[in-house]
């Protein structure tokens, strides 16, 4: 029961602004230190902006409770959404498909990341701190934050863009099933997701520390490389650009696009014919629309918070307390809220859609091929369907059925 | 036994300078961060200076940030601290404390008077 | 700065009594690594002060039983169940979890 000492950052240029401080349970992990310490290069500690405590102290009950619904409303959420995608052949269809690679992507964020944070957010330190499977966890945590979220946004665009060409290509049809671009796109989503965190797999080690004298360790982003000086020095930049502007803009820019296509075949013969189909994909469209605008809200507080500190917040000014205080109070419910992105999905997929919704409501009850009543339902690519419970194969596909997704 | 023994204090002019030691003994000092602590006359105690177990980092509370310099020597087991710039405000009595999560040893203190 | 308000400034006990002294901190004393750095000190007349209570509620070593820390967040008090002359002096109580650290003003403990 030694006391401890206090704190040393070595040679690391720590600021006094942090998620969670330490908490980041966002997929934008800053460095995380003790952030009652200013060490700047000088090597000399400066006051600290104590209103910060009273921000964190709250905020980790309150992180700890969100986190902890996360974690079961994001499980059963999302496990059930690839449940009802996998177990329902019908359901299997391109953006289907990527709506269940969306889901994956949360739900190994929600059942990892989430109790490390947890962990985190009670012990005050990092788990296995001073062992090596807490530097295995060290660098796993940030990177499967950026892959979720890499995940996220990638088939977010995809989604936009198959929304597009499901109009641009309307007079083609397509049965049931994941047609091979589609799956060739959902692969290439989770390589580049991986790829574009393999940074923060790198950059992120446990550094000790000082505090009062006692050596502790924490996980942060300490940049030994020069490519790792330049990630750390724009990498605020590159998260908004990327991983936040990317998809609002390629939703725009397609929907603009599909909006066009729409109004210029208007007047169409065929257009009148497939009117049904029409509706229907105007229903997905509104579906994946609604993910967009969900991901921006949950979203645009976080990366809001991180740009302002990084623009307007100088920790060597005297007035800075206020400042800090304000960011440090976005900055967690931009987090919590970013957080809940994970697992808001099968909600918002349950009150916009009613084949998710029919689909969540019998799997939840028992599962969806097990309903005791003859069924009919709408999937997401508008295809009409029936089937009884033990025949899933004995689909009646409407001759009229078409493309939403490339063949 | 931990032992922390003060020297260098006494009686100096305003706006002159001094150098107070504090030689450590019965524990590694290496390892241990260290502190001053000034009392003056109204009993008041008032954290002066802190230094990590490298000194590599320092603190300094703000009435004397700039001009006093904290520091040691871990080959010989030394904490200083140099005080320049005196003033009457600076008159008490010194004391280093070992810092482990707490000063959990304290020396009997040097005394130093600005007149 | 952290400002500790120690409460009261001078406390006459009989030998025996139980003394109970309060600080209250104007900011949350909780640190990021989950600690809270409270700590108590005493010194007796003629002596340098020395650690009794450290994080909170933790005695150091050769501490007798008696002396008991207590609070959290804001809060702490310093509880001597049974006053003995040797306990005699003026109380500090300290917060170590954020710069620039600080002492309260001290509590005199002192016989009726």
């Known amino acids: 029961d030694n006391p401890e000492r206090y704190s040393t950052n070595l040679s690391n240029h720590v600021d006094d602004f942090t998620t969670f401080r330490g908490t980041e349970l966002s997929f934008l992990v800053t460095t995380h230190q003790p952030t009652n310490l200013v060490l700047p290069s000088n090597g000399s500690m400066h006051n600290y902006c104590p209103q910060q405590t009273k921000i964190t102290s709250a905020f980790k009950y309150i992180n700890t409770v969100i986190s902890c619904t996360i974690f079961i409303v994001g499980m059963v959420g999302n496990a059930t959404l690839l449940r009802i995608i996998y177990q329902n052949k019908c359901m299997r269809n391109g953006p289907n498909a990527l709506i269940a690679s969306l889901a994956l992507g949360d739900l190994i964020y929600v059942v990892i990341d989430l109790p490390i944070n947890v962990f985190k957010l009670l012990a005050g330190r990092w788990p296995f701190d001073h062992n090596d499977f807490g530097v295995f966890l060290c660098k796993l945590f940030p990177f499967l934050q950026k892959s979720s979220v890499g995940i996220t946004v990638l088939n977010l665009c995809a989604l936009s863009v198959d929304r597009y060409r499901a109009v641009a290509s309307w007079s083609r049809v397509q049965g049931i099933g994941i047609p091979l671009v589609t799956a060739i796109e959902i692969v290439s989503i989770w390589i580049l997701s991986f790829i574009l965190a393999i940074p923060e797999a790198i950059g992120f080690v446990m550094v000790p520390f000082e505090y009062r004298g006692e050596q502790h360790k924490t996980c942060m982003l300490n940049a030994t490389s020069k490519f790792m000086e330049f990630y750390q020095d724009v990498k605020d930049w590159w998260l908004f650009g990327f991983y936040f502007c990317m998809p609002l803009v390629c939703t725009a820019i397609f929907y603009t696009l599909m909006t066009c296509e729409m109004l210029n075949r208007r007047n169409g013969s065929l257009r009148i014919a497939l009117s049904e189909h029409l509706k229907q994909r105007r229903e997905v469209a509104k579906t994946v629309f609604c993910l967009v605008v969900i991901f921006a809200l949950c979203w645009f507080p976080l990366h809001l918070s991180r740009i302002l500190k990084k623009t307007v917040y100088n920790e060597m000014d005297k007035n800075r307390c206020e400042l800090l205080s304000f960011l440090l109070l976005m900055d967690y419910i931009g987090i919590n809220l970013a957080t809940m992105n994970s697992c808001i999905n099968p909600i918002a997929l349950y009150f916009v859609s009613k084949k998710f919704k029919n689909c969540f409501q019998s799997c939840l009850c028992c599962c969806c091929y097990q309903s005791k009543s003859l069924m009919t339902s709408v999937p997401m690519n508008g295809t009409s369907i029936q089937w009884k419970n033990h025949d899933q194969n004995n689909h009646n596909t409407d001759r009229s059925s078409h493309k939403d997704s490339m063949n | 036994d931990v032992h922390l023994v003060e020297s260098g204090g006494g009686l100096v002019q305003p706006g002159g300078s001094l150098t107070v030691s504090c030689a450590a003994s019965?524990?590694?000092?290496?390892?241990?961060?260290m502190s001053w602590v000034r009392q003056t006359r109204d009993k008041r105690l008032e954290l002066v200076a802190t230094?990590?177990?490298?000194?590599?980092?320092?603190y300094y509370s703000d009435n004397v940030k700039g001009r006093f310099t904290i520091s040691r020597d871990n080959a010989k087991n030394t904490l200083y601290l140099e005080m320049r710039g005196l003033r009457s405000g600076d008159t008490a009595m010194y004391y280093c404390?070992?810092?482990?999560?707490?000063?959990?040893?304290w020396g009997q203190g040097t005394s130093v008077t600005v007149s | 700065e952290v400002v500790m308000t120690q409460t009261p400034l001078s406390l006459p006990v009989s030998l025996g009594d139980q003394a109970s002294i309060s600080c209250r901190s104007s900011?949350?004393?909780?640190?990021?690594?989950?600690?809270?750095?409270v700590e108590w000190y005493l010194q007796k007349p003629g002596q340098s002060p020395k650690l009794l209570i450290y994080?909170?509620?933790n005695r150091f070593s050769g501490v007798p039983d008696r002396f008991t820390g207590s609070g959290s967040g804001t809060d702490f008090t310093l509880k001597i169940s049974r006053v003995e002359s040797e306990d005699l002096g003026i109380y500090y109580c300290?917060?170590?979890?954020?710069?620039?650290?600080?002492f309260g003003s001290g509590t005199e403990l002192e016989i009726k």
């Open positions: 404390a070992r810092d482990y999560g707490a000063m959990d040893y």
């Open positions: 019965g524990f590694t000092f290496s390892t241990y961060g």
């Open positions: 230094i990590n177990t490298n000194g590599g980092n320092t």
């Open positions: 900011h949350y004393l909780v640190h990021d690594n989950g600690n809270t750095y």
């Open positions: 994080k909170v509620s």
């Open positions: 300290f917060q170590g979890s954020h710069f620039p650290f600080t």
